[in-house]
């Protein structure tokens, strides 16, 4: 299923990444889909 609004799929974690948590670390590969 696609990720919910405000989140993005992370191939590194095999789960949806909450983009709000990426604001503090935009340079993490986990956050690539939130850029």
């Amino acid at each position: 299923a696609p990720c919910s609004r405000g989140s993005s799929w992370s191939a590194d974690l095999d789960k949806c990444m909450d983009c709000a948590s990426c604001a503090a670390r935009p340079h993490s590969d986990f956050c690539l889909g939130c850029a």
Partner: antibody, heavy 120, light 108 residues
Framework: EVQLLESGGGLVQPGGSLRLSCAAS????????MIWVRQAPGKGLEWVSY????????HYADSVKGRFTISRDNSKNTLYLQMNSLRAEDTAVYYC?????????????WGQGTLVTVSS | DIQMTQSPSSLSASVGDRVTITCRAS??????LNWYQQKPGKAPKLLIY???SLQSGVPSRFSGSGSGTDFTLTISSLQPEDFATYYC??????????FGQGTKVEIK
């Protein structure tokens, strides 16, 4: 009880190969990212490689890229590190560790380590 | 790459002393900083995660603070079992993580 048990270390000549294993028990292995970290004799900790829970995504330190391959078999609860073209500077204790937290922010369980010695 | 620099590299202290170890990042890492303890011949053990959260089972004499580039690990009253090497580690650039060079706490 969570346990990670490394094996496969030993003495190998420069240019040789080794395959390290890390057997996991006491937890459900498949949802967790895993890493390898090494420690040269008398030195600090160096991250080596990362693998996603499914094994579909991998990352490597520049020092081992193109020579080492990380993989996992979730059906066997085992993590691997294939080490090729070994160099003297690869001599170290190799640890596997489990990524903790929702977003892999720390490593909450470590194996006891296996020693790799590269020497002629 | 983000470099992590610990100070001091080693220190001598007595049982009961308050000990402070500093970790400085070469750029801001927000609060993505963890601390580990390692005893000779043993694997590292997680003490503090996300700068200030105490890992389950770790004694409350250990505490962490800081944000941005400067972080501190404090042992409020050093115990005999605390003599070890301590490492900081940043996860800001996960999965590409880096460790500090370590701080060895020795008996005075």
């Amino acid at each position: 009880e969570v346990q990670l048990l490394e094996s496969g270390g030993g003495l190998v000549q420069p240019g040789g190969s080794l395959r390290l294993s890390c057997a996991a028990s006491g937890f459900t292995f498949s949802p967790y990212p895993m890493i390898w970290v090494r420690q040269a004799p008398g030195k600090g900790l160096e991250w080596v490689s990362y693998i996603s829970p499914s094994g579909g995504s991998t990352h490597y330190a520049d020092s081992v890229k193109g020579r080492f391959t990380i993989s996992r078999d979730n059906s066997k609860n085992t993590l691997y590190l294939q080490m090729n073209s070994l160099r003297a500077e690869d001599t170290a204790v190799y640890y596997c560790a489990r990524g903790g937290d929702t977003y892999f922010d720390y490593f909450d369980y470590w194996g006891q380590g296996t020693l790799v010695t590269v020497s002629s | 790459d983000i470099q992590m620099t610990q100070s001091p590299s080693s220190l001598s202290a007595s049982v009961g002393d308050r000990v402070t170890i500093t970790c400085r990042a070469s750029q801001s890492i927000s609060g993505y900083l963890n601390w580990y303890q390692q005893k000779p011949g043993k694997a590292p053990k997680l003490l503090i995660y996300q700068a200030s959260s105490l890992q389950s089972g770790v004694p409350s004499r250990f505490s962490g603070s800081g944000s941005g580039t400067d972080f501190t690990l404090t042992i409020s009253s050093l115990q005999p079992e605390d003599f070890a090497t301590y490492y900081c580690q940043q996860s800001y650039t996960s999965p590409f993580i880096t460790f500090g060079q370590g701080t060895k706490v020795e008996i005075k």
